[in-house]
């Protein structure tokens, strides 16, 4: 939906309006789609085009958003790294998981260190 | 689970205005669309709007665009409903509730709204 | 705005009766469709979610079907708790909007 700009516009100079204010965005026909905000001072009023988004998938991208943790430490048994992710915000009609793994493989650089380490371990 | 607790309904002269609250508790209540749904006596449900917590995104049923305010309070896991210049039409018990299209919905119990002088 | 039509709009039925509700969309969304039961002085409670996706803790008694714009509710057979308003509600678009409901009476 369109977000709401009903901050006032200040007048041009020489107008008597020192402060517009505009209304919503309302589409020409059903809900979504063009449309004009209407916008008042004093006596004038003013039309200016502005459009309502149809379709929620364009609006909020992806589906699924997560807010992931920091990197976990390379397993060298794997040559992999994991992070968590946790649901931060879902398209309303997307069935996202509440928590999500990720993996990654180790830079050759953490890879040899997290082998370096294992090897001291053994000793 | 997610429960969500309603306060701030009541008796309201025409005109004037009422902040509805619906407290969440549980599971992480940023993460849902918290819906606004009301529901005159003896008759069926009428969708107010909806609001993310996490971005404060609000979609309003544009028959309310002029009569109803969404907000949130993460830091108290409270989502609002601000009502104004009401008539006696809007009469009615006014629900919240959290959606997840993966799990479902909980709902709140509802507060009943009286607009009458 | 999309329109949903109940029906029938009071059904009177026995317990051990197969109940069979019907929503009706003004035009196709998809699956978009979910169905509630409410009781008197208590919240709607979801049943069904996306046409035909059970809810946990929701007998299997309960089954939905769709897609497109002809949807039902069935309630293979009918226990005396059962007897409350039933309505659909679409999430295709906004503005999300309900059936008129369908009471289930005891007959």
């Known amino acids: 939906v369109a977000k709401k700009k009903d901050k006032v516009k200040k007048g041009g100079p020489g107008s008597e309006c020192a402060e517009w204010a505009w209304g919503p965005c309302t589409p020409s026909s059903k809900d979504c789609g063009v449309g004009f905000r209407e916008g008042t001072c004093g006596a004038q009023t003013q039309r200016i085009r502005c459009r309502v988004p149809c379709n929620w998938k364009k609006e909020f991208g992806a589906d699924c958003k997560y807010k992931f943790e920091n990197w976990g430490a390379c397993d060298g048994g794997t040559g992999t790294k994991v992070r968590q992710g946790t649901l931060k915000k879902a398209r309303y009609n997307a069935q996202c998981q509440e928590t999500i793994r990720v993996t990654k493989p180790c830079t050759p650089k953490t890879k040899a260190k997290a082998k370096a380490k294992k090897g001291k371990g053994k000793d | 689970q997610v429960q969500l607790v309603q306060s701030g309904g009541g008796l309201v002269q025409p005109g004037g205005s009422l902040r509805l609250s619906c407290a969440a508790s549980?599971?992480?209540?940023?993460?849902?669309?918290m819906n606004w749904v009301r529901q005159a006596p003896g008759q069926g449900l009428e969708w107010i709007g909806m609001i993310h917590p996490s971005d404060s995104e609000t979609i309003l049923n544009q028959k309310f665009k002029d009569k109803a305010t969404l907000t949130v309070d993460i830091s108290k896991n409270t989502a609002y409903l601000q009502m104004n210049s009401l008539r006696a039409e809007d009469t009615a018990v006014y629900y919240c509730?959290?959606?997840?299209?993966?799990?479902?919905?909980?709902w709140g119990q509802g507060t009943l709204v009286t607009v009458s002088s | 705005e999309i329109v949903l039509t109940q029906s029938p709009a009071t059904l009177s039925l026995s317990p051990g009766e197969r109940a069979t509700l019907s929503c009706r969309a003004s035009e196709s969304i998809s699956n978009n469709l979910h169905w509630y039961q409410q009781k008197p002085g208590q919240a709607p409670r979801l049943l069904i979610k996306?046409?035909?996706q059970s809810i946990s803790g929701i007998p299997a008694r309960f089954s939905g079907s769709g897609p497109g714009t002809d949807f039902t509710l069935t309630i293979s057979s009918v226990e005396p708790e059962d007897f409350a308003v039933y309505y659909c509600?679409?999430?295709?678009?906004?503005?999300?909007?309900f059936g008129g409901g369908t009471k289930l009476e005891i007959k």
């Open positions: 509600q679409q999430s295709n678009s906004w503005p999300l909007t």
């Open positions: 509730s959290s959606w997840s299209a993966k799990r479902g919905d909980f």
């Open positions: 996306y046409a035909s």
């Open positions: 549980g599971q992480s209540f940023s993460s849902y669309w």
